[in-house]
């Protein structure tokens, strides 16, 4: 016999969405009498957020469905429902089981730069030099495509001097020089970087932008004939 069941549903789904089915067996006759007819009910829900009636169960099939809007993985990633199964169509003996409902992540949170402004200093002519690490926060599930950041230099890099990659563990944006900078030609670059996720947003979300002021430091260069 199974006294714990597990199911899953995407956060933000509409009421009426089916989650899972629980089953209790009763060897008594269910054709000519009600002795073997099982009726299901939800006895309790933990946690009771955003309120205590997030799910309903079909009395005769044991199918659990979402009954209320507001499933939010970032607030409650998992619900525990205590299910009662009662024979004689609800008037007889009762047994209890647990249904664990996983709330699966949707990309409903945008990554946000923190901080949004940076200043960096880079020696001229340095190629592959790490200029700055940009930090973002994202409330979606860590290490998922909805959390992993994708960085894009939106402006300020007219000469294609810079590149930005995502650190696989920290999720930081690592800004480096693609080619050497020339202090004499331009001693300051102001870059605008936008961050999104590997996964598309499931709703319209504002994208976060960071500003990086890069100061080019003069290096004493040998005279050229």
């Amino acid at each position: 016999t199974q006294d714990t069941f597990r199911g899953s549903v995407l956060e933000g789904v509409l009421p009426g969405t089916s989650v899972m089915q629980v089953t209790a067996t009763d060897e008594d006759d269910a054709i000519y009498t009600y002795n073997g007819v099982v009726a299901y009910s939800i006895h309790s829900q933990e946690p009771k957020d955003p309120h205590d009636l997030m799910f309903t169960i079909h009395r005769s099939t044991g199918t659990i469905s979402v009954i209320s809007s507001g499933l939010d993985r970032e607030k409650v990633p998992e619900y525990t429902l205590t299910i009662q199964a009662t024979d004689m169509d609800g008037d007889g003996s009762t047994t209890t089981a647990v249904a664990v409902v996983e709330i699966l992540d949707a990309n409903d949170n945008a990554p946000m730069f923190d901080p949004q402004k940076y200043e960096a200093h880079v020696p001229e002519n340095a190629v592959g030099h790490e200029v700055q690490r940009l930090t973002v926060t994202d409330l979606d599930a860590p290490n998922s495509p909805a959390w992993r950041a994708t960085y894009l230099i939106m402006g300020g890099d007219d000469g294609d001097h810079f590149t930005i990659t995502t650190h696989p563990e920290s999720n930081q944006g690592i800004l480096t020089t693609r080619k050497g900078l020339d202090f004499e030609a331009k001693n300051q670059h102001t870059l605008y970087v936008e961050v999104t996720n590997e996964a598309p947003f499931v709703l319209k979300l504002p994208t976060s932008t960071a500003t990086i002021v890069v100061h080019v430091e003069d290096v004493n260069e040998a005279p050229v004939f």
Partner: antibody, heavy 118, light 113 residues
């Protein structure tokens, strides 16, 4: 590297309340389940309860009437209160981190011994 | 609650030999939707907290030597140490996280013969 550190009184009188705090360093408290697990001397591990960063909790039914957990995300801390303690509550108390939907415990505190005695 | 039962309670194995610890759950911890077994293994040395070795029944935690392996599905699981080292002397626990009432096995004490 994420580190957890338990703190609180090592001695509690019978019928009083045991209070422990776990401080998380080297990483954010957000986005994880934080559990308390205890181990009486020479015995096995017993899960007490867990709290998520939004504050929702689930407790071991055998302790539910006596347990309260809380979280303070601004301090990167979470806490345990166990009321009406008896000698049977004497144990090493560990705090631990688990992932939502996959609550195995990858990070543990060193543990703190709490003795219930008059 | 899902009960976890380990066998044996204690085990003595010679250095370099294979050690096998079993864990049985009172109901299946396999979730058919993702085909994952919600089971973990821990090692605990005296005076230390437990250390995660294996999760999802067979996935080795980062930094854990490859002599440790986990296998099994449904209700029956095994932790194997392919070649016992002196530092492997410890108590080993299994844990299920299929139910939100997380439960551990009673532990298996591993010693050197």
């Amino acid at each position: 590297q994420v580190q957890l550190q338990e703190s609180g009184p090592g001695l509690v009188k019978p019928s009083e309340t045991l209070s422990l705090t776990c401080t998380v360093s080297g990483g954010s408290i957000s986005g994880y389940y934080w559990s308390w697990i205890r181990q009486p001397a020479g015995k096995g591990l017993e899960w007490i309860g867990r709290i998520y960063t939004s504050g929702n909790t689930i407790y071991n039914p055998s302790l539910k009437s006596r347990v309260t957990m809380s979280v303070d995300t601004s301090k990167n801390q979470f806490s345990l209160r166990l009321t009406s303690v008896t000698a049977a509550d004497t144990a090493v108390y560990y705090c631990a981190r688990g992932n939502p939907l996959a609550t195995y415990f990858g990070y543990w505190g060193q543990g703190t011994l709490v003795t219930v005695s008059s | 609650d899902i009960e976890m039962t380990q066998s044996p309670d204690s085990l003595a194995v010679s250095l370099g030999e294979r050690a096998t610890i079993n864990c049985k759950s009172s109901q299946s911890v396999l979730y058919s939707s993702n085909n994952k077994n919600y089971l973990a293994w821990y090692q605990q040395k005296p005076g230390q907290p437990p250390k995660l070795l294996i999760y999802w029944a067979s996935t080795r935690e980062s930094g854990v030597p490859d002599r440790f392996s986990g296998s099994g599905s449904g209700t029956d699981f095994t932790l194997t140490i392919s070649s016992l080292q002196a530092e492997d002397v410890a108590v080993y626990y299994c844990q299920q996280y299929y139910s939100t009432m997380y439960t551990f096995g009673q532990g298996t004490k591993l010693e050197i013969k």
